[in-house]
């Protein structure tokens, strides 16, 4: 399945929106920094695009869920958040179209399931961190930066997959 060219443009717009959403500097939050253990290897070891797409879909779905909460709405600029949702929604649609095209393979490889689980656990760690930090401005800033980092890494993987074909 070939993702439309607009998909990578959307990814760049998503990163731009995440950058614009910044309210305070990470420098003000040194003591709140945290290693969430982004499962980078789950993106690096997917050799075929067919295996990668469900993992990327899970990643974007989890980002959408994270920023769709009541606490998130209180933390960020509403206009930017709406634009952010729109971009994520479009990317989910693009990826879903690819997942549907690949439905011919009825058995989901175990490796793919493990990768999806690793992504879910990563977001559970983020959610727990926010809860423990009582959704403070610094906690949200640390999370925003972390999502930028992990989203950027997964986007780079997408690009490398496209260039290999």
């Amino acid at each position: 399945c070939d993702l439309p060219q607009t998909h990578s443009l959307g990814s760049r717009r998503t990163l731009m929106l995440l950058a614009q959403m910044r309210r305070i500097s990470l420098f003000s939050c040194l003591k709140d920094r945290h290693d969430f253990g982004f499962p980078q290897e789950e993106f690096g070891n997917q050799f075929q695009k067919a295996e990668t797409i469900p993992v990327l879909h899970e990643m974007i779905q989890q980002i959408f869920n994270l920023f769709s909460t009541k606490d998130s709405s209180a933390a960020w600029d509403e206009t930017l958040l709406d634009k952010f949702y729109t971009e994520l929604y479009q990317q989910l649609n693009d990826l879903e179209a690819c997942v549907i095209q690949g439905v011919g393979v009825t058995e989901t490889p175990l490796m793919k399931e493990d990768s999806i689980l690793a992504v879910r656990k990563y977001f559970q760690r983020i959610t727990l961190y926010l809860k423990e930090k009582k959704y403070s401005p610094c906690a949200w800033e640390v999370v925003r930066a972390e999502i930028m980092r992990s989203f950027s890494l997964s986007t780079n993987l997408q690009e490398s997959l496209r260039s290999k074909e």
Epitope: M16, A19, Q20, R22, I24, S25, L26, F27, S28, L30, R33, D35, A145, E146, M148, R149, S152
Partner: antibody
Framework: QVQLVQSGAEVKKPGASVEVSCKAS????????INWVRQAPGQGLEWMGW????????TYAQKFQGRVTMTRDTSTSTVYMELSSLRSEDTAVYYC?????????????WGQGTLVTVSS | DIQMTQSPSSLSASVGDRVTITCRAS??????LAWYQQKSGKAPKLLIY???SLQSGVPSRFSGSGSGTDFTLTISSLQPEDFATYYC?????????FGPGTKVDIK
């Protein structure tokens, strides 16, 4: 690609002040904190402080507190570092430096440096 | 302030040599450490961040390790362009501090 371009060399007398500018081009100015790092001739690197171009928030190293002021002009995408009550030990190359959006404390982008000479 | 020390302060090596530089912090800094390379008259260049992550575009012969107070920068096979001064920097707390540097020159 973001670039940091600094103002030219300065020669100042002891007791005077100097202002060094750092202009960001090719990127979103407000996205990255700008740090100032200096290096005396033949010496190591010394962090002076940082400024958030978006809010204007600053943190200065205790050593420079009261003598350094960092400001920004969002209309020209420029940050400024002013050091007052100059003494000979302030003779150094002054660099502005910036990190990425998610690890701004690691400086992957540097200006070319501005030599400030303090001499009577 | 957190003090950073480096050893050796200088070393002479040949092309192809394996070079190891150590950096020690006066208190635990977890993995909040970077390594920079600086050539004469130039601005420093980021090589390694978060103690062991290789900065984009930096050759894989450079590697970093360590956490807490003791860190190492290794150049697996020294190349002519690697002769320079190397600095470590802690990013754990303000003020950020650098090590005094290690100068690597030709034997």
């Amino acid at each position: 690609q973001v670039q940091l371009v600094q103002s030219g060399a300065e020669v100042k007398k002891p007791g005077a002040s100097v202002e060094v500018s750092c202009k960001a081009s090719g990127g979103t100015f407000s996205s990255y904190a700008i740090n100032w790092v200096r290096q005396a001739p033949g010496q190591g690197l010394e962090w002076m402080g940082w400024i958030d171009p978006k809010s204007g928030d600053t943190t200065y190293a205790q050593k420079f507190q009261g003598r350094v002021t960092m400001t920004r002009d969002t209309s020209t995408s420029t940050v400024y570092m002013e050091l007052s009550s100059l003494r000979s030990e302030d003779t150094a190359v002054y660099y502005c430096a910036s990190g990425g959006s998610y690890s701004p404390w690691y400086f992957d982008l540097w200006g070319q440096g501005t030599l400030v000479t303090v001499s009577s | 302030d957190i003090q950073m020390t480096q050893s050796p302060s200088s070393l002479s090596a040949s092309v192809g040599d394996r070079v190891t530089i150590t950096c020690r912090a006066s208190q635990s800094i977890s993995s909040w450490l970077a390594w920079y390379q600086q050539k004469s008259g130039k601005a420093p260049k980021l090589l390694i961040y978060a103690a062991s992550s290789l900065q984009s575009g930096v050759p894989s012969r450079f590697s970093g390790s360590g956490s807490g107070t003791d860190f190492t920068l290794t150049i697996s096979s020294l190349q002519p362009e690697d002769f320079a001064t190397y600095y470590c920097q802690q990013a754990y707390s303000f003020p950020f501090t650098f090590g005094p540097g290690t100068k690597v020159d030709i034997k």
